[in-house]
Interface confidence: low
């Protein structure tokens, strides 16, 4: 038991400390008082605290706790924030390069297709970017639209260059024929599979990182309960009321208080562990057709192969399409 | 095969590499992130202990405060919480998490389920044919030799893959703040909360 304060004891030390905490306020007793109105720092004898001081201590204790929590999560928070930003930018760079590679392939191999091809390729990769960022676009529709748009240009510029390229009638017929006749063989299906799988995984990876940020932000900005505030005040500040300015809380006592204050937060632990391990599993599986870097940067080659496939079947296709779209062509020549 | 479009449309600045010791791909980046994240796997269970170790606690002193009185650091009284007749620590724990914490737990459950679904190896075996062969038979018209297949990865491998460090403005080993200029640069310094209280400890 600490000895009771000597009769000449004043609250000078407590006063000067409290003044720094709350400048200009005269809430500190000159000399120790009974403190019968105190609700948190219940005195065993005369005390240098008043009810107002107690309130200020509670406020400060909760603020300290919030700051300590933010300090604790700072490194983790920046790790995830930063990676989310880096990966988002990196994915955009992959998309940009994939578009550039595809455009370069058209420019070098099929210069006559370039103006329109560039446009269709650009639209396709814009959709890819939007999908990664969470847009509600269907990947199969994106791929179909790319090939539907490309085929009329390939037909009019490469397979049948004598046709005028201005009329829309034949274009609509050619778009339909593209699917009915499987003009590009199985390449569109191959691209759909690869692109949809790699983009799906990429999208969920980014979603998971963004949720990680949300988790940390949530716990970072928790407001602690009044009960917790009282416990923290007793631990950190009630000793001051007895003039014990230099004494620190016992370690075991601190752990008990913190476990009480953070009981709710600690419940996240199980799901947080599972989150990291599930994310690890996802990352370990992000290769081959599940790796968008691999898939998108090779798309130019697959698209080139698909056009070569059309070229190799051009004779048969021209005859079939000539019959199929004859009505549209006649209307054009009139 | 297609004319390899190297250098044609790629910004020249991409190729200016700052201190990259090896070819960095996104996959190595992802693995690096997971390794770093795994060091935080016990983050939430360790929080109470972390906060105690980063706030003033008696370490070398003989005496310490137990909420009611000054006691010897290793005595029975030191671990007592000094809260009897005030508010029950057990009650505080029984209240359960705040609604905002419950919400975030639900979101975590949902994303964990999604992540597990996406990682399911069973689902992948079914795709393997498409991935490796590229085509089902009979899909290529009359001449089977016209089938241009997606062997291996179903595509030509792009040389070196991208050296992403060269393009990105920041590298995770030499990282600056997130894209948001409002944010501070990362560091894990303890915010000196108690310094605000007049350096009493």
């Amino acid at each position: 038991q600490p000895p009771p304060p000597p009769p000449d004891a004043t609250c000078h030390q407590v006063r000067s400390f409290f003044q720094r905490l709350q400048p200009g306020l005269k809430w500190v007793p000159e000399t120790p008082v009974p403190g019968s109105d105190l609700q948190v720092c219940l005195p065993k004898g005369p005390t240098c605290c008043s009810r107002k001081m107690e309130e200020k201590y509670q406020l400060t204790a909760r603020l300290n706790m919030e700051q300590l929590l933010q300090s604790a999560s700072m490194e983790l928070k920046f790790l995830i924030i930063q990676n989310a930003a880096v990966f988002q930018e990196a994915f955009e760079i992959v998309v940009r390069h994939a578009k550039n590679y595809t455009n370069a392939m058209f420019k070098n191999n099929y210069p006559s297709l370039t103006p329109q091809a560039f446009e269709f390729v650009g639209e396709f990769f814009t959709d890819v970017s939007l999908y990664i960022l969470g847009s509600d676009i269907n990947v199969d529709d994106m791929v179909n639209e790319l090939f539907d748009s490309l085929f009329p240009v390939i037909y009019t510029q490469l397979m049948n260059p004598g046709l005028p390229d201005s009329a829309l009638d034949i274009n609509e017929c050619l778009r339909g024929a593209r699917r009915d006749l499987k003009v590009f063989g199985n390449f569109p299906k191959l691209i759909m599979t690869q692109v949809s799988k790699s983009l799906q995984v990429t999208r969920i990876f980014l979603q998971a990182l963004n949720l990680g940020i949300e988790v940390i932000n949530t716990t970072d900005h928790l407001k602690f309960s009044k009960d917790c505030g009282r416990m923290l005040t007793r631990m950190w500040y009630c000793s001051y009321c007895q003039g014990l300015m230099m004494v620190k809380p016992c370690g075991g006592y601190c752990n008990v208080v913190m476990q009480g204050c953070m009981a709710g937060v600690v419940e996240i632990d199980k799901y947080w562990r599972e989150y990291i391990l599930s994310l690890e599993e996802l990352v370990n599986g992000m290769y081959r057709i599940y790796d968008m870097e691999n898939v998108l940067l090779g798309l130019f080659s697959t698209i080139h192969d698909s056009i070569q496939y059309v070229q190799k079947n051009a004779g048969k296709l021209t005859t079939t399409i000539g019959k199929l779209c004859a009505h549209s062509q006649q209307r054009q020549y009139r | 095969s297609a004319y390899y479009p190297e250098d044609l449309f790629i910004d020249k600045k991409v190729l200016k590499v700052a201190h990259v010791e090896h070819e960095e791909t996104l996959s190595s980046r992802r693995r690096e992130l997971i390794q770093k994240l795994k060091s935080f796997i016990s983050f939430y269970s360790a929080l109470p202990g972390y906060i105690c170790s980063h706030s003033p606690v008696a370490e070398n002193d003989t005496l310490c405060w137990n909420g009611q009185e000054l006691v010897e650091r290793y005595s029975q009284k030191a671990a007592r919480n000094g809260m009897k007749n005030q508010f029950n620590l057990h009650e505080l724990k029984m209240k359960g998490p705040e609604p905002v914490v419950s919400q975030i737990i639900d979101k975590l459950k949902h994303i964990n389920q999604l992540l597990r679904t996406m990682s399911m190896p069973k689902g992948r075996v079914l795709d393997k044919n498409l991935d490796e062969e590229g085509f089902e038979s009979g899909d290529c018209g009359d001449d089977e030799d016209e089938c241009i297949g997606g062997s291996g990865d179903g595509m030509i491998k792009v040389k070196n893959q991208l050296r992403f460090l060269a393009e990105l403005a920041y590298d995770l080993d030499v990282d600056d703040a997130p894209g948001n200029s409002q944010q501070a640069t990362p560091k894990d310094n303890e915010i000196s909360t108690f310094h605000n209280l007049g350096n009493v400890h």
Epitope: - | K36, Q182, A184, T185, K187, D188, I191
Partner: antibody, heavy 120, light 107 residues
Framework: EVQLVESGGGLVQPGGSLRLSCAAS????????MNWVRQAPGKGLEWVSY????????YYADSVKGRFTISRDNAQNSLYLQMNSLRDEDTAVYYC?????????????WGQGTMVTVSS | DIQLTQSPSFLSASVGDRVTITCRAS??????LAWYQQEPGKAPKLLIY???TLQSGVPSRFSGSGSGTEFTLTITSLQPEDFATYYC?????????FGQGTKVEIK
């Protein structure tokens, strides 16, 4: 009194190694990130390296990456800089500096510096 | 890397003068800029951080302003102890970089 004291400087040949130490006192060393900054004779300041309080996050300037290693021992209140493959251009006064504890970074406490001379 | 360019590099002034030093960043650094003072043979001393926040113990004649890419350090009434070299530093992104310095000499 808050203080940082560097030691370990001296004359070393190109290609050689040196280990600098920085002893901290008067503050909770384990709660602060720490930096090394150097200043070549008659020149300006150049940031060299940073370590977070837990050593989980470490950064280097391009000019020293792969040659210098920053480390710390929180139990000993000490910061270190292991310098290998030293070059003439590494000749400088090396300061250790504390990273401020607030939201915004700044080097609020500096040591007096230790001179490193690389010469054959 | 972000380059910081201070101007002027040398400045001659008299006691009581108002002095302004400019620091330009090669790209936007928001408000992540600090100013240091270094006397010959001594370690640098932090004057201002976060563009305009005065470090405790630094006289109020020192002030900082700016944002983005253009920043200034102002000494309203130069005192004898202010003759020194001043450096700006960006802390927006790694590697952290310093300006080349501005030497304030007695006229």
């Amino acid at each position: 009194e808050v203080q940082l004291v560097e030691s370990g400087g001296g004359l070393v040949q190109p290609g050689g190694s040196l280990r600098l130490s920085c002893a901290a006192s008067g503050f909770t060393f384990s709660g602060f990130g720490m930096n090394w900054v150097r200043q070549a004779p008659g020149k300006g300041l150049e940031w060299v390296s940073y370590t977070s309080s837990s050593s989980r996050t470490i950064y280097y300037a391009d000019s020293v990456k792969g040659r210098f290693t920053i480390s710390r021992d929180n139990a000993q209140n000490s910061l270190y800089l292991q310098m290998n493959s030293l070059r003439d251009e590494d000749t400088a006064v090396y300061y250790c500096a504390r990273d401020s504890s607030g939201w915004y970074d700044a080097f609020d406490i500096w040591g007096q510096g230790t001179m490193v001379t690389v010469s054959s | 890397d972000i380059q910081l360019t201070q101007s002027p590099s040398f400045l001659s002034a008299s006691v009581g003068d108002r002095v302004t030093i400019t620091c330009r960043a090669s790209q936007d650094i928001s408000s992540y800029l600090a100013w240091y003072q270094q006397e010959p043979g001594k370690a640098p001393k932090l004057l201002i951080y976060a563009t305009s926040t005065l470090q405790s113990g630094v006289p109020s004649r020192f002030s900082g302003s700016g944002s983005g890419t253009e920043f200034t350090l102002t000494i309203t009434s130069l005192q004898p102890e202010d003759f020194a070299t001043y450096y700006c530093q960006q802390l927006n992104s790694y590697p952290w970089t310093f300006g080349q310095g501005t030497k304030v000499e007695i006229k």
